[in-house]
Protein backbone atom coordinates (compact mmCIF):
# COMPACT_ATOMS: atom_id res chain seq x y z
CA UNK A 1 0.00 0.00 0.00
CA UNK A 2 2.79 2.41 0.95
CA UNK A 3 4.49 1.74 -2.39
CA UNK A 4 1.25 2.39 -4.28
CA UNK A 5 0.62 5.63 -2.41
CA UNK A 6 4.17 6.77 -3.20
CA UNK A 7 3.60 6.16 -6.88
CA UNK A 8 0.39 8.17 -6.75
CA UNK A 9 1.73 10.99 -4.60
CA UNK A 10 5.47 11.70 -4.84
CA UNK A 11 5.08 14.20 -1.99
CA UNK A 12 4.56 11.38 0.52
CA UNK A 13 8.27 10.57 0.19
CA UNK A 14 9.33 14.02 1.46
CA UNK A 15 10.59 13.64 5.04
CA UNK A 16 10.22 16.08 7.92
CA UNK A 17 12.46 19.07 7.40
CA UNK A 18 11.56 19.26 3.71
CA UNK A 19 8.57 20.26 1.61
CA UNK A 20 7.21 19.03 -1.68
CA UNK A 21 8.14 21.80 -4.09
CA UNK A 22 5.49 22.23 -6.79
CA UNK A 23 7.71 24.76 -8.55
CA UNK A 24 10.42 22.15 -8.99
CA UNK A 25 8.46 19.16 -10.26
CA UNK A 26 7.43 18.05 -6.78
CA UNK A 27 10.94 17.27 -5.61
CA UNK A 28 11.67 17.42 -1.90
CA UNK A 29 13.33 20.75 -1.05
CA UNK A 30 14.78 21.59 2.37
CA UNK A 31 12.77 24.02 4.44
CA UNK A 32 14.13 27.55 3.97
CA UNK A 33 15.74 29.35 6.91
CA UNK A 34 13.35 30.23 9.77
CA UNK A 35 10.87 27.53 8.78
CA UNK A 36 10.24 23.88 9.62
CA UNK A 37 8.12 20.85 8.79
CA UNK A 38 7.56 18.43 11.64
CA UNK A 39 5.93 15.73 9.52
CA UNK A 40 6.62 14.20 6.12
CA UNK A 41 4.67 14.87 2.95
CA UNK A 42 4.11 18.58 3.57
CA UNK A 43 3.65 20.98 0.66
CA UNK A 44 4.86 23.98 2.64
CA UNK A 45 7.07 24.59 5.65
CA UNK A 46 5.71 26.51 8.63
CA UNK A 47 7.30 29.75 9.81
CA UNK A 48 9.31 29.38 13.02
CA UNK A 49 7.96 31.04 16.11
CA UNK A 50 9.91 34.13 17.15
CA UNK A 51 10.86 34.38 20.81
CA UNK A 52 11.40 38.11 21.21
CA UNK A 53 10.17 40.92 23.41
CA UNK A 54 8.82 39.43 26.62
CA UNK A 55 9.52 35.94 25.24
CA UNK A 56 12.92 34.29 25.16
CA UNK A 57 14.10 31.17 23.39
CA UNK A 58 13.89 27.93 25.35
CA UNK A 59 14.53 25.75 22.31
CA UNK A 60 15.80 26.96 18.93
CA UNK A 61 13.79 26.28 15.80
CA UNK A 62 15.17 23.46 13.66
CA UNK A 63 14.16 22.25 10.20
CA UNK A 64 11.93 19.64 11.86
CA UNK A 65 10.58 21.38 14.96
CA UNK A 66 9.30 24.80 15.94
CA UNK A 67 11.04 27.08 18.42
CA UNK A 68 9.79 26.98 22.00
CA UNK A 69 9.60 30.13 24.09
CA UNK A 70 9.44 30.90 27.78
CA UNK A 71 9.25 34.28 29.50
CA UNK A 72 11.85 36.80 30.56
CA UNK A 73 12.56 37.05 34.31
CA UNK A 74 9.68 38.67 36.18
CA UNK A 75 7.08 37.01 33.94
CA UNK A 76 5.53 33.55 33.75
CA UNK A 77 3.96 31.55 30.95
CA UNK A 78 0.24 31.32 30.32
CA UNK A 79 -1.63 29.31 27.72
CA UNK A 80 -0.69 26.33 25.60
CA UNK A 81 2.94 26.45 24.53
CA UNK A 82 3.52 29.65 26.49
CA UNK A 83 1.36 31.73 24.17
CA UNK A 84 1.40 34.64 26.64
CA UNK A 85 3.60 35.96 29.41
CA UNK A 86 2.04 37.45 32.52
CA UNK A 87 3.85 39.68 34.98
CA UNK A 88 4.89 38.11 38.29
CA UNK A 89 3.70 39.76 41.48
CA UNK A 90 5.06 39.31 45.01
CA UNK A 91 3.52 36.82 47.39
CA UNK A 92 0.64 38.61 49.09
CA UNK A 93 -0.37 40.32 45.84
CA UNK A 94 -2.45 39.68 42.73
CA UNK A 95 -2.23 41.08 39.23
CA UNK A 96 -4.97 43.53 38.28
CA UNK A 97 -5.46 45.75 35.23
CA UNK A 98 -3.55 48.43 37.10
CA UNK A 99 -0.62 46.20 38.06
CA UNK A 100 0.20 44.26 41.21
CA UNK A 101 -2.06 45.02 44.20
CA UNK A 102 -1.89 43.75 47.77
CA UNK A 103 -4.40 41.10 48.78
CA UNK A 104 -7.43 42.49 50.63
CA UNK A 105 -7.81 41.64 54.32
CA UNK A 106 -9.10 38.11 54.68
CA UNK A 107 -7.41 36.87 51.50
CA UNK A 108 -3.95 35.56 50.68
CA UNK A 109 -1.70 34.51 47.80
CA UNK A 110 1.33 32.36 48.51
CA UNK A 111 2.58 32.43 44.90
CA UNK A 112 3.96 35.00 42.41
CA UNK A 113 0.99 34.38 40.11
CA UNK A 114 -2.73 33.82 40.43
CA UNK A 115 -5.34 35.58 42.51
CA UNK A 116 -5.80 36.24 46.20
CA UNK A 117 -7.97 33.53 47.79
CA UNK A 118 -10.03 33.75 50.98
CA UNK A 119 -8.55 32.39 54.18
CA UNK A 120 -9.91 29.02 55.20
CA UNK A 121 -12.93 29.29 57.50
CA UNK A 122 -11.83 27.01 60.32
CA UNK A 123 -15.24 27.07 62.00
CA UNK A 124 -16.81 25.27 59.01
CA UNK A 125 -14.84 22.21 60.12
CA UNK A 126 -15.59 22.82 63.77
CA UNK A 127 -12.01 23.97 64.33
CA UNK A 128 -10.45 27.12 65.69
CA UNK A 129 -7.77 29.40 64.26
CA UNK A 130 -4.38 28.25 65.51
CA UNK A 131 -2.28 30.69 63.47
CA UNK A 132 -3.75 33.87 61.98
CA UNK A 133 -3.69 34.34 58.23
CA UNK A 134 -1.63 36.99 56.46
CA UNK A 135 -1.59 38.36 52.89
CA UNK A 136 0.96 35.66 52.05
CA UNK A 137 -0.31 32.72 54.11
CA UNK A 138 -3.60 30.97 54.85
CA UNK A 139 -4.77 30.57 58.43
CA UNK A 140 -3.73 27.40 60.22
CA UNK A 141 -6.68 25.61 61.79
CA UNK A 142 -6.23 23.85 65.08
CA UNK A 143 -8.35 21.45 67.05
CA UNK A 144 -11.71 22.75 68.22
CA UNK A 145 -12.08 23.74 71.88
CA UNK A 146 -13.96 20.47 72.49
CA UNK A 147 -10.98 18.49 71.20
CA UNK A 148 -8.81 20.13 73.81
CA UNK A 149 -10.98 19.01 76.76
CA UNK A 150 -9.35 16.51 79.16
CA UNK A 151 -9.32 12.98 77.79
CA UNK A 152 -9.88 14.04 74.22
CA UNK A 153 -7.39 12.88 71.63
CA UNK A 154 -5.04 15.64 70.52
CA UNK A 155 -4.69 14.10 67.06
CA UNK A 156 -7.24 15.46 64.61
CA UNK A 157 -7.81 13.55 61.36
CA UNK A 158 -7.34 15.71 58.28
CA UNK A 159 -10.48 17.52 57.19
CA UNK A 160 -11.88 16.65 53.77
CA UNK A 161 -10.85 19.06 51.01
CA UNK A 162 -13.34 21.86 50.46
CA UNK A 163 -13.50 25.32 48.94
CA UNK A 164 -11.98 27.80 51.39
CA UNK A 165 -14.56 30.05 53.04
CA UNK A 166 -14.25 33.42 54.71
CA UNK A 167 -12.96 33.31 58.26
CA UNK A 168 -14.81 35.26 60.92
CA UNK A 169 -13.42 38.79 61.19
Amino acid sequence: FERTRSLQDPCSNCPAGTFCDNNRNQICSPCPPNSFSSAGGQRTCDICRQCKGVFRTRKECSSTSNAECDCTPGFHCLGAGCSMCEQDCKQGQELTKKGCKDCCFGTFNDQKRGICRPWTNCSLDGKSVLVNGTKERDVVCGPSPADLSPGASSVTPPAPAREPGHSPQ
Partner: antibody, heavy 116, light 107 residues
Framework: QVQLVQSGAEVKKPGASVKVSCKAS????????INWVRQATGQGLEWMGW????????GYVQKFQGRVTMTRNTSISTAYMELSSLRSEDTAVYYC?????????WGQGTLVTVSS | DIQMTQSPSSLSASVGDRVTITCRAS??????LNWYQQKPGKAPKLLIY???SLQSGVPSRFSGSGSGTDFTLTISSLQPEDFATYYC?????????FGPGTKVDIK
Protein backbone atom coordinates in the same frame (compact mmCIF):
# COMPACT_ATOMS: atom_id res chain seq x y z
CA GLN B 1 28.82 57.69 20.11
CA VAL B 2 26.38 55.17 18.65
CA GLN B 3 25.62 55.76 14.98
CA LEU B 4 23.76 53.90 12.24
CA VAL B 5 24.56 55.22 8.77
CA GLN B 6 22.47 54.01 5.85
CA SER B 7 23.15 53.88 2.12
CA GLY B 8 21.78 56.51 -0.26
CA ALA B 9 18.46 56.84 -2.05
CA GLU B 10 17.51 54.33 -4.75
CA VAL B 11 15.16 54.40 -7.73
CA LYS B 12 14.01 50.99 -8.93
CA LYS B 13 11.66 49.58 -11.54
CA PRO B 14 8.75 47.31 -10.55
CA GLY B 15 9.90 43.70 -10.23
CA ALA B 16 13.48 44.68 -9.38
CA SER B 17 15.28 44.24 -6.03
CA VAL B 18 16.88 46.77 -3.72
CA LYS B 19 19.54 46.24 -1.06
CA VAL B 20 19.89 48.85 1.67
CA SER B 21 22.90 48.88 3.99
CA CYS B 22 23.20 50.07 7.58
CA LYS B 23 26.70 50.59 9.02
CA ALA B 24 26.94 50.57 12.81
CA SER B 25 29.61 52.29 14.89
CA UNK B 26 30.16 53.30 18.51
CA UNK B 27 29.13 49.94 20.01
CA UNK B 28 29.70 46.20 19.62
CA UNK B 29 27.70 45.37 16.50
CA UNK B 30 27.02 41.76 17.50
CA UNK B 31 25.51 42.69 20.88
CA UNK B 32 22.13 44.01 19.70
CA UNK B 33 19.57 43.00 17.09
CA ILE B 34 19.04 45.25 14.10
CA ASN B 35 15.43 45.91 13.09
CA TRP B 36 14.07 47.37 9.87
CA VAL B 37 11.10 49.74 9.78
CA ARG B 38 9.62 51.47 6.75
CA GLN B 39 7.46 54.55 6.30
CA ALA B 40 5.56 55.49 3.16
CA THR B 41 5.16 59.21 2.51
CA GLY B 42 2.70 60.72 4.97
CA GLN B 43 2.07 57.33 6.59
CA GLY B 44 2.94 55.67 9.89
CA LEU B 45 5.78 53.33 10.85
CA GLU B 46 5.67 49.70 9.70
CA TRP B 47 7.95 47.10 11.27
CA MET B 48 9.47 44.67 8.76
CA GLY B 49 11.60 42.32 10.83
CA TRP B 50 14.82 41.81 12.74
CA UNK B 51 18.23 40.23 12.47
CA UNK B 52 20.61 39.04 15.15
CA UNK B 53 24.09 40.10 13.96
CA UNK B 54 25.77 37.52 16.17
CA UNK B 55 23.94 34.40 14.97
CA UNK B 56 22.48 35.68 11.72
CA UNK B 57 19.02 34.59 12.89
CA UNK B 58 16.19 36.59 11.39
CA GLY B 59 12.46 37.07 11.76
CA TYR B 60 10.21 38.73 9.22
CA VAL B 61 6.67 40.06 9.24
CA GLN B 62 4.36 37.66 7.41
CA LYS B 63 3.52 40.15 4.64
CA PHE B 64 7.20 40.41 3.65
CA GLN B 65 8.01 36.70 4.03
CA GLY B 66 9.63 35.40 0.84
CA ARG B 67 10.42 38.92 -0.45
CA VAL B 68 12.73 40.23 2.27
CA THR B 69 16.18 39.02 3.29
CA MET B 70 18.16 40.49 6.17
CA THR B 71 21.87 39.71 6.34
CA ARG B 72 25.02 41.12 7.88
CA ASN B 73 28.77 41.39 7.48
CA THR B 74 30.21 41.42 10.99
CA SER B 75 33.73 42.27 9.79
CA ILE B 76 32.50 45.71 8.67
CA SER B 77 29.64 46.01 11.25
CA THR B 78 27.05 46.37 8.53
CA ALA B 79 23.50 45.04 8.26
CA TYR B 80 21.62 44.69 4.98
CA MET B 81 17.98 44.53 4.02
CA GLU B 82 17.11 43.26 0.55
CA LEU B 83 13.56 43.53 -0.77
CA SER B 84 12.72 41.79 -4.04
CA SER B 85 9.81 41.83 -6.52
CA LEU B 86 9.36 45.52 -5.85
CA ARG B 87 6.02 47.18 -6.51
CA SER B 88 4.93 50.80 -6.42
CA GLU B 89 3.53 50.43 -2.87
CA ASP B 90 7.07 49.61 -1.64
CA THR B 91 8.02 53.26 -2.23
CA ALA B 92 9.00 54.40 1.25
CA VAL B 93 11.79 55.49 3.54
CA TYR B 94 13.48 52.42 5.05
CA TYR B 95 15.08 52.73 8.48
CA CYS B 96 17.40 50.43 10.38
CA UNK B 97 17.22 50.63 14.17
CA UNK B 98 19.18 49.11 17.03
CA UNK B 99 17.02 47.12 19.43
CA UNK B 100 17.79 47.15 23.14
CA UNK B 101 14.19 46.31 23.96
CA UNK B 102 12.97 49.57 22.44
CA UNK B 103 14.61 50.94 19.28
CA UNK B 104 17.07 53.34 20.86
CA UNK B 105 19.12 54.39 17.83
CA TRP B 106 17.92 54.78 14.24
CA GLY B 107 19.62 55.25 10.89
CA GLN B 108 18.86 58.41 8.95
CA GLY B 109 16.64 56.50 6.52
CA THR B 110 16.95 55.47 2.87
CA LEU B 111 14.34 56.56 0.36
CA VAL B 112 13.46 53.78 -2.08
CA THR B 113 11.31 54.88 -5.02
CA VAL B 114 9.67 52.23 -7.20
CA SER B 115 8.55 53.66 -10.50
CA SER B 116 8.28 52.47 -14.08
CA ASP C 1 -1.00 40.33 16.13
CA ILE C 2 -1.28 43.05 18.74
CA GLN C 3 -3.05 46.16 17.44
CA MET C 4 -2.10 49.58 18.77
CA THR C 5 -4.45 52.56 18.68
CA GLN C 6 -3.74 56.19 19.57
CA SER C 7 -5.92 59.14 20.39
CA PRO C 8 -6.27 61.80 19.35
CA SER C 9 -4.94 61.39 15.80
CA SER C 10 -4.00 65.08 15.86
CA LEU C 11 -4.20 68.00 18.25
CA SER C 12 -3.47 71.71 18.22
CA ALA C 13 -1.81 73.23 21.24
CA SER C 14 0.11 76.30 22.33
CA VAL C 15 3.55 76.65 23.86
CA GLY C 16 3.26 76.02 27.60
CA ASP C 17 0.23 73.75 27.30
CA ARG C 18 0.03 70.38 29.03
CA VAL C 19 -0.51 67.73 26.35
CA THR C 20 -1.70 64.16 26.89
CA ILE C 21 -1.68 61.40 24.25
CA THR C 22 -3.16 57.98 24.92
CA CYS C 23 -2.25 54.62 23.45
CA ARG C 24 -4.20 51.38 23.77
CA ALA C 25 -3.10 47.81 23.04
CA SER C 26 -5.51 45.11 21.86
CA UNK C 27 -4.20 42.79 24.60
CA UNK C 28 -2.16 43.17 27.74
CA UNK C 29 1.47 44.06 27.01
CA UNK C 30 2.49 44.67 30.63
CA UNK C 31 4.92 47.61 30.43
CA UNK C 32 6.43 46.70 27.04
CA LEU C 33 5.42 50.06 25.56
CA ASN C 34 7.69 52.69 24.01
CA TRP C 35 7.08 56.23 22.77
CA TYR C 36 8.86 57.91 19.84
CA GLN C 37 8.91 61.45 18.49
CA GLN C 38 9.32 62.07 14.77
CA LYS C 39 9.84 65.37 12.98
CA PRO C 40 9.34 65.76 9.21
CA GLY C 41 12.20 64.29 7.18
CA LYS C 42 13.87 62.83 10.27
CA ALA C 43 14.14 59.39 11.85
CA PRO C 44 12.04 58.64 14.94
CA LYS C 45 13.64 59.36 18.31
CA LEU C 46 13.05 57.26 21.42
CA LEU C 47 11.50 59.25 24.27
CA ILE C 48 10.09 56.72 26.76
CA TYR C 49 10.67 52.97 27.11
CA UNK C 50 9.13 50.42 29.44
CA UNK C 51 5.99 52.61 29.63
CA UNK C 52 7.52 55.14 32.03
CA SER C 53 11.34 55.21 31.80
CA LEU C 54 12.80 58.38 30.32
CA GLN C 55 15.43 57.76 27.65
CA SER C 56 18.79 59.37 28.39
CA GLY C 57 18.99 62.95 27.12
CA VAL C 58 15.22 63.42 26.82
CA PRO C 59 13.84 66.46 28.72
CA SER C 60 11.96 65.71 31.94
CA ARG C 61 8.81 67.45 30.67
CA PHE C 62 8.10 64.16 28.87
CA SER C 63 6.63 61.40 31.02
CA GLY C 64 4.87 58.11 30.42
CA SER C 65 2.50 56.01 32.49
CA GLY C 66 0.28 52.95 32.28
CA SER C 67 0.51 49.18 32.13
CA GLY C 68 -1.51 46.35 30.64
CA THR C 69 -3.51 47.88 27.80
CA ASP C 70 -3.77 51.61 28.52
CA PHE C 71 -0.86 54.04 28.32
CA THR C 72 -0.32 57.79 28.38
CA LEU C 73 2.40 60.14 27.15
CA THR C 74 2.33 63.54 28.83
CA ILE C 75 4.24 66.69 27.88
CA SER C 76 3.95 68.90 30.95
CA SER C 77 4.73 72.19 29.25
CA LEU C 78 4.86 72.13 25.46
CA GLN C 79 7.95 73.73 23.91
CA PRO C 80 8.38 74.97 20.30
CA GLU C 81 10.63 71.98 19.49
CA ASP C 82 7.95 69.51 20.63
CA PHE C 83 5.69 70.07 17.62
CA ALA C 84 6.01 66.69 15.92
CA THR C 85 4.29 63.33 15.46
CA TYR C 86 4.33 60.87 18.36
CA TYR C 87 4.12 57.10 17.99
CA CYS C 88 3.63 54.37 20.58
CA UNK C 89 5.06 50.91 19.92
CA UNK C 90 4.68 47.56 21.68
CA UNK C 91 7.81 45.45 22.14
CA UNK C 92 5.95 42.67 23.99
CA UNK C 93 5.87 40.20 21.10
CA UNK C 94 6.50 40.01 17.38
CA UNK C 95 5.35 41.39 15.09
CA UNK C 96 6.30 44.56 16.93
CA UNK C 97 3.62 47.10 16.07
CA PHE C 98 3.30 50.87 16.14
CA GLY C 99 0.31 53.06 16.79
CA PRO C 100 -0.89 55.21 13.88
CA GLY C 101 0.65 58.34 15.38
CA THR C 102 -0.56 61.60 16.93
CA LYS C 103 0.39 64.85 15.21
CA VAL C 104 0.89 67.79 17.56
CA ASP C 105 0.78 71.11 15.76
CA ILE C 106 0.64 74.79 16.70
CA LYS C 107 -2.73 76.29 17.58
Amino acid sequence: QVQLVQSGAEVKKPGASVKVSCKASGYTFTSYDINWVRQATGQGLEWMGWMNPNSGNTGYVQKFQGRVTMTRNTSISTAYMELSSLRSEDTAVYYCARETGPFDYWGQGTLVTVSS
Amino acid sequence: DIQMTQSPSSLSASVGDRVTITCRASQSISIYLNWYQQKPGKAPKLLIYGASSLQSGVPSRFSGSGSGTDFTLTISSLQPEDFATYYCQQSYSTPFTFGPGTKVDIK
